[in-house]
Structure formats: C-alpha cells, structure tokens
C-alpha cells in the first residue's frame, strides 16, 4: 500500500545508519517528474536542511545544505541510474565522511558531511513519486 | 474533499474557455514546492503540449510550449500573486490571441497562443499541490 | 604525502595587491573533494580564514575580507593564488595555504610551512 | 574578534590533565578541529571531528562537544606539548572560523 507523500518521519542518524526509500515516478521522464529527499535538523519543514538530495528524473540530481535558512554550493550530478517509468530503491547510508546513495544496489552518488549527521531529527520524502517504503536503519551497538 | 494528483481531464477549448483549479501548495514557500498546469495534444502524457504553466512557488513562474517533443522558448514571470500557505484559485482563459491567467481573480500572466487552442485534448495539473476543484468551462455558442 | 609551498613577495607597499601562490606536491587541486585554503596569522595573534578555493574552482570568501579577496587557479602548474588588493600595515601576517578534504568548515589536515609578509613602505 | 573564544592561558603539572576549551560555536551542527601550533611552525592538526585523532598523535590528546562547548583534553601532558593551540568550526560550511588560541604551559 502506498504511503502518503510528502512523508515525513521522525529520524535519528549517525554513522552507521542507512535510510531506504522505494517508489516509483508519477510521470514520465519527458515531463520531468522530480523526487527529493530532504534530511531536517527539526520536526518543522521550514528547518535547515543537512542533506537535501533531489532528482529531476531522466536530467540530472542536485545536493546541497540549508544553512540558518540559507542555501549552500550546490553539487550537481548527470549520473542517472533512474529507469524511466520504472520502480526505484533509493538508500542513503551515513558513512564517517560522507553520505552514500544507492539505486537499485548501485552507489551512485556521494555527498560530504557539512554537518553532523546527528543534527538530524527528521527525513522528508517528497515531489512526484508514489511511496511504497521507508525504513531508517540503525546500527546496532 | 480532495482531487487524485496528478490530475488530467479530457478537454476541448476554443476562445471563450476558461479552465479553473482550485488548490494549495503542499509545502511552504521556502521549500520550494512547484504546481503545474499542461494542455496536452493527446490524452497521453507524453504529447505535445499547446500550453506549460509551471509556478515554483515564491520564486517565479515558467510557461512554454512543448512542439515534436522539443521545448520551446521558455517565458518567465517574477510576478509572484500566490500567498504563502494559503488557498488559491486560478483560471486560465482562452482569448482569441493568447491565454489570460488569473490568480485569486487578478490578472497575473498572459501566453501568446503558439499553437491553436482546438489542438488541446487534455489538461493535467500536478506536482506539488492539493487539489479541491478542477473544472472546465465552454462558452455558449 | 602531499605537500604544499607558499611564495610570493615579503614586502608589500600599502594600497598595493599581494598576490601569493601555493604549489600542490603528491596530490591535485582538482580531486574530489578537496577544499583549498589561505589562512593568515597576524605577528602574535591567532588564524584567520580567508578564503578557498574548491575541487571544482567554485570560490569561498571571508565575509570581512571579500571585497578585497580573490582566490584563483592555475590547474596545470596545480597552483592556487591569493590576492588581496589594497593592503595596509594591518595585514602584515604569515600566509599559510592548507587542505580541507571534506569541507572549508572542517579540518585541515596539511599545510605549508608559511610564508611571512610585511606591508611597510 | 572570533566567534569561538578559548582562555589565553592554561597551565597544567606534568603528568597531569590539561583542558582546554572553546566555546560559542555550534558544535552540535558543525565538528571541531583542534590544531596545535609551536613557534615558527605552521600548525598540526591533533584533533578532527570533535574526537577523532590524525595518525602519528599521541592517544593523550582527546577531544569532546557538546552545544556550543569543545573541549581538547591532553591526559599525562609532556614537556614537548607546551605549544599554542587552536580550535576550528564553521558558522556555516562555507566557512572557517578559527578560536584565538590558548598557550599551553607544563609546570
């Protein structure tokens, strides 16, 4: 069944920690359907963003930081590993340096740590995609 | 209650028409959340389209024509009538030379037509939106 | 080990620019994602910040220094160069250039050796 | 004027735990970098990411954060630790922002 969107859920991450997301575009790549994935230090949607990562499917996938409401140098990719019309498994792991993005199994993007990933306190998943998971994985201690 | 999104209708407009949607941002400004509004040829989504009215609210709005599956010179408005968090109405109407869009019943935004308004057979409206009215109104003959 | 080389002039004239360069050894400016810095301490003082310049060759500056600030790159010599225009006694200083792999906010883990510059006429 | 401030002087006993701290950064949105400076050398970096420490420093020197507090801890100091030290965060990632320093001293 689908989950609403957008989905926001409470988050607690640090190394270790791996957020999985699976979907799928509610439009074809021709019209540029978008999906973003925004890691927030509140509950509130207007907070700042750690990690905000979003995809304008079939084009290209943009990476920044929103900073006391400002936003950062954003870091552009072409990599596109989306498949047009196509079911996607997105997981994003916290390594000690960096975040890690998989699709589909294959990493894919990386984006440096501006900030501590234990910030965090919540992870929205939004634009147009329909949802069918999320999970957030802690390591165990 | 609220409308399936993405949204799309059959359609036939000619000068006179007006198309009215009612509908809220799912997202405050800051974050940046778009609406848009595409007259296509063809009922299917991948078709050309007479008419692109792409709100990235807060920021700016985009219109263009999508020809052969190219786009085509974008047009671009800061004009900014949408308010932050609140509901609002928009009607797009047909005049004999171009489109006349109005927000919350002012005149914001005018597109020359580039293709005839006959040619329209659909018109979808998404992305980051909820959606409460969508109707189609034809003109006496 | 990568190594890095400040040179440039000791004595600079004031309202004149400084312009210092910094040569790369055992690593390039251009890998991913190494941030690429000038950091100044005046004679008894403590480190200032002034600006970078990052893997890519987008620029950061210190906002009480940016108007005066300019931080570029000579790829194929793997340089970056400072300079600072209109400079007065008060930026008499060692320059050191240094490496953040991670992000201007986060550590430097090398530096050169600095060079000291003395703004007298 | 910095936006993090360290005390000017601290001074510990052989042998003994010295702290030295920085206050007024945001340290639980940016990491803390420590840096340890002797005269006519250029500064080493002894502690990054609050707590973690570059090889080839010694298991004495430690760092913590909490709020707007880091704190770099040099259990069983030595003579040769006597030096100028420095601690680095961000006001915003696109920046560097450097406390004034603090001179260590071994009585």
């Known amino acids: 069944s689908l989950l609403p969107v957008p989905y926001t859920e409470a988050a607690s991450l640090s190394t270790g920690s791996t957020v999985t997301i699976k979907g799928r575009p509610l439009a074809c790549f021709l019209n540029e359907p978008y999906l973003q994935v925004d890691f927030h230090t509140e509950m509130k949607e207007e907070s700042d963003i750690v990690f905000h990562f979003q995809v304008c499917f079939g084009r290209r996938v943009v990476m920044n930081s929103r900073e006391y409401g400002a936003w950062k140098q954003q870091v552009e990719s072409k990599n596109m590993p989306f498949q047009d019309g196509q079911e996607f498994e997105l997981s994003i792991s916290v390594l000690p340096d960096k975040y890690q993005v998989m699709v589909n199994g294959q990493s894919s993007y990386t984006f440096d740590h501006r900030i501590k990933p234990e910030a965090v306190k919540m992870v929205q998943v939004w634009r147009d995609i329909s949802l069918t998971k999320f999970n957030v994985s802690y390591l165990k201690r | 209650s609220l409308l399936p999104v993405p949204y799309t209708e059959a359609a036939s407009l000619s000068t006179g028409s007006t198309v009215t949607i009612k509908g809220r941002p799912l997202a405050c400004f800051l974050n940046e959340p778009y609406l848009q509004v595409d007259f296509h040829t063809e009922m299917k989504e991948e078709s050309d389209i007479v008419f692109h009215f792409q709100v990235c609210f807060g920021r700016r709005v985009v219109m263009n024509s999508r020809e052969y599956g190219a786009w085509k010179q974008q047009v671009e408005s800061k004009n900014m009538p949408f308010q932050d968090g609140q509901e609002f109405e928009l009607s797009i109407s047909v005049l004999p030379d171009k489109y006349q869009v109005m927000v919350n019943g002012q005149s914001s935004y005018t597109f020359d037509h580039r293709i005839k308004p006959e040619a329209v057979k659909m018109v979808q409206v998404w992305r980051d939106i909820s959606l409460t009215k969508f109707n189609v109104s034809y003109l006496k003959r | 080990q990568v190594q890095l080389q400040e040179s440039g002039p000791g004595l600079v004239k004031p309202s004149q620019t400084l312009s210092l360069t910094c040569t790369v050894s055992g690593g390039s400016i251009t890998t991913n994602y190494y941030y690429w810095s000038w950091i100044r301490q005046p004679p008894g003082k403590g480190l200032e910040w002034m600006g970078a310049?990052?893997?890519?060759?987008?620029?950061y500056y210190s906002p009480s220094l940016k108007s005066r600030t300019s931080i570029s790159r000579d790829t194929s010599k793997n340089q970056f160069t400072l300079q600072l225009s209109s400079v007065t006694p008060e930026d008499t200083a060692v320059y050191y250039c240094?490496?953040?792999?991670?992000?201007?906010?986060?550590?430097?883990?090398?530096w050169g050796q600095g060079t000291q510059v003395t703004v007298s006429s | 004027h910095s936006a993090v401030t360290q005390p000017s002087a601290v001074s510990v006993s052989l042998g003994q735990t010295a702290r030295i701290t920085c206050q007024g950064g945001k340290f639980g949105r940016y990491y803390a970098s420590w840096y340890q400076q002797k005269p006519g050398q250029a500064p080493v970096l002894v502690i990054y990411k609050d707590s973690e420490r570059p090889s080839g420093i010694p298991e004495r020197f430690s760092g913590s954060s909490s709020g707007d507090t880091a704190t770099l801890s040099i259990s069983g100091a030595q003579a040769e630790d006597e030096a100028d030290y420095f601690c680095?965060?961000?006001?915003?990632?696109?920046?560097?922002?450097f406390g004034g320093g603090t001179h260590l001293t071994v009585l």
């Open positions: 310049i990052a893997y890519s060759g987008s620029t």
């Open positions: 680095q965060s961000g006001r915003s990632s696109d920046n560097a922002v």
């Open positions: 240094a490496r953040a792999p991670y992000g201007i906010s986060r550590e430097y883990d090398y």
